[in-house]
Interface confidence: low
């Protein structure tokens, strides 16, 4: 595929990489999927930088990122190093709570209200946001 | 720096009962997992239980559930091991390491099981 | 569980040598795998996280490669204070597992 040199129409550019913020909410398997179909992932934040900027962005609003346990250890969408890779965890977080009364604990992580992350069910319809970076190869066949 | 100390090895009766710790410092304590992984004497090494910064998920291995309870005091930066019914496969020197991919480990705490 | 084949057992090899220690896991786990270098009586040392991350304050005569289910860790020319026991472990799902070890010995 070609290399995608600038983001797409409406999508806001950062650091070589490209954002989409959306302003309606899906479950966090939707949003994934979601990304998926924009050849993009959901949002995987490497960087205080890269936190300040996303959270400048969605404001105080829960929003679904590209992180999630569902299968047991934590793990980042586009296969980044959870454990050694930065982390902006709420106190106390991510706890899995069972309290919920949803059935299960919490297998997907969120920005909260004031941007640090916690655990949550993950059927909970937040807002979500997407990222793909500048320069990959694009999935669109090249222009003959 | 990363420091992992544990304490609470020694000599117990098949049975018995011992409690492992392990203090932290030289980092964020509360938003890592940690691990205890243990080692038989001249074997490899055995992952034994992890826990999250939140205490909210638990793992064991096979061969220490129902006997074994991990548990930690974010307060305190203490990584703790509740070791009952022991048995004389338990022998083995403990460690606590930090995050699913044990990127620093304490020096260890030897747990001998024997009558 | 995801069991990690490690090969070969031991080998004695020169200080100078190339060496190389094969892990297989017996599933996919994607990059989730970590490589430790442990000496008689001490705790072990991560080498590698993530491959093919190094560690921090690792040299880089180790490197580790690999994706999915066969993985390597190449010591590029092997020094006295790399006569050691090397694992492998993965941490894609629990129960974390490690191989069974590589004793590299003085030949």
């Known amino acids: 595929g070609s290399e995608r040199t600038c983001c797409p129409v409406n999508w806001v550019e950062h650091e070589r990489s490209c954002y989409w913020f959306s302003r309606s909410g899906k479950a966090w398997a939707d949003a994934d999927n979601y990304c998926r179909l924009e050849d993009a992932h959901l949002v995987v934040v490497t960087s205080w930088e890269e936190q300040k900027f996303v959270q400048h962005h969605i404001g105080p609003v829960n929003t679904w990122m590209g992180l999630h346990d569902q299968n047991g250890p934590w793990k980042w969408v586009d296969g980044t190093d959870y454990e050694t890779g930065f982390k902006n965890w709420r106190p106390e977080q991510p706890d899995d709570w069972y309290g919920h009364g949803l059935g299960g604990g919490e297998d997907c992580a969120h920005f909260t209200d004031d941007g640090r992350w916690n655990d949550d069910v993950c059927q909970r319809p937040y807002r979500w946001v997407c990222e793909t970076e500048l320069d990959k190869a694009s999935q669109e066949p090249p222009l003959l | 720096e990363v420091q992992l100390v544990e304490s609470g090895g020694g000599l117990v009766k098949p049975g018995g009962s011992l409690r492992l710790s392990c203090a932290a410092s030289g980092f964020t304590f509360s938003t890592y997992n940690l691990n205890w992984v243990r080692q038989a004497p001249g074997k490899g090494l055995e992952w034994v239980s992890s826990?999250?910064?939140?205490?909210?998920?638990?793992y064991y291995s096979d061969s220490v559930k129902g006997r074994f309870t991990i548990s930690r005091d974010n307060a305190k930066n203490s990584l703790y091991l509740q070791m009952n019914s022991l048995r004389a496969e338990d022998t083995a020197v403990y460690y606590c390491?930090?995050?699913?991919?044990?990127?620093?480990w304490g020096q260890g705490t030897l747990v001998t099981v024997s009558s | 569980d995801i069991q990690m084949t490690q090969s070969p057992s031991s080998l004695s090899a020169s200080v100078g040598d190339r060496v190389t220690i094969t892990c297989r896991a017996s599933?996919?786990?994607?990059?989730?795998l970590a490589w430790f270098q442990q000496k008689p009586g001490k705790a072990p040392k991560s080498l590698i996280y993530?491959?093919?991350s190094l560690q921090s304050g690792v040299p880089s005569k180790f490197s580790g490669s690999g994706s999915g289910t066969e993985f390597t860790l190449t010591i590029s020319s092997l020094q006295p204070e790399d006569f050691a026991t090397y694992y492998c472990q993965q941490y894609n799902s629990y129960p974390l597992t490690f191989g069974g070890g590589t004793k590299v010995e003085i030949k």
């Open positions: 993530a491959t093919p």
């Open positions: 826990i999250s910064g939140g205490a909210g998920h638990i």
């Open positions: 599933q996919d786990i994607s990059n989730y």
């Open positions: 390491a930090r995050t699913n991919g044990f990127d620093f």
